[in-house]
Interface confidence: low
């Protein structure tokens, strides 16, 4: 079963993604997700989490890194990296700016 939405107090988070309705959002926790799609530069998105807290516990891979935190605007200045591939020269950098 999917994790139910948190009913605890909400935290204000920095929101930076095409889905944001403004520079902040409110959720059960804050998130930063760095995703690398095939043939593209990594995309880093910041926002709020309410479902699937188990994603926060996942280890970084060469394709995705999912970070979570629980305090006011805690995701604001966090920059993530992806797990290095076998060829160090191909390791992508973050693209948060």
């Amino acid at each position: 079963d999917p994790v139910k939405p948190s009913r605890g107090p909400l935290v204000t988070c920095t929101c930076e993604s095409p889905h944001c309705r403004g520079p902040t959002c409110q959720g059960a926790w804050c998130t930063v997700v760095l995703v690398r799609e095939e043939g593209r530069h990594p995309q880093e998105h910041r926002g709020c989490g309410n479902l699937h807290r188990e994603l926060c516990r996942g280890r970084p891979t060469e394709f995705v890194n999912h970070y979570c935190c629980d305090s006011h605007l805690c995701n604001r200045n966090v920059s993530l990296v992806l797990e290095a591939t076998q060829t160090p020269s191909e390791q992508p950098g973050t693209d948060s700016q």
Epitope: C15, E16, S17, P23, S96, Q97
Partner: antibody
Amino acid sequence: QLQLQESGPGLVKPSETLSLTCTVSGGSISSRSYYWGWIRQPPGKGLEWIGNIYYSGSAFYNPSLKSRVTISVDTSKNQFSLKLSSVTAADTAVYYCARWDNWDVGAFDIWGQGTMVTVSS
Amino acid sequence: QSALTQPPSASGSPGQSVTISCTGTSSDVGGYNYVSWYQQHPGKAPKLMIYEVSKRPSGVPDRFSGSKSGNTASLTVSGLQAEDEADYYCTSFAGSNNWVFGGGTKLTVL
């Protein structure tokens, strides 16, 4: 050093559409930590927020102007634009474009120099 | 959405301190720390002086300070100088898709 430059006609006739463009130089409009905004100032009056846009095209507007405003972004040209329809003399103002920095500052930290638009027949 | 309330004018002699208030609601000033202050000289674009209630951008003199209590934010200019004479505007983020400005305060250095 990032700079913003407004451009567009300085005179618009009543009932027509005001169109302005803001060109971003010295940085990318596609930076994920910035929102891009339009703010205006009628002669002798205060500042009024018109609307903001994200590089993805998500836009949000002042409720009092929402029915007449469209803000769009062209990442290929590093520009974002304002269209205000059905203008009246009350829309005469200096129009500024500005950057909202969501990473370091949490404020409109960089502004264009402004462009005066007069609505008159 | 209503403009934030600022006094139309404020004044002080050189060397004195002046405080300008900016009153909003729990939906804007009271609800977020995204309160900023701008200085505008005649014919010029606004310049950021204070951000996030009390932080100063580099290059802004430490004579300028900001604070907030409840739904009211304040800008204090201490050790007034002639070049501080200008209009000052506050602004606040006001929820998921709105920003709101104050009506502006004309600061006169006597």
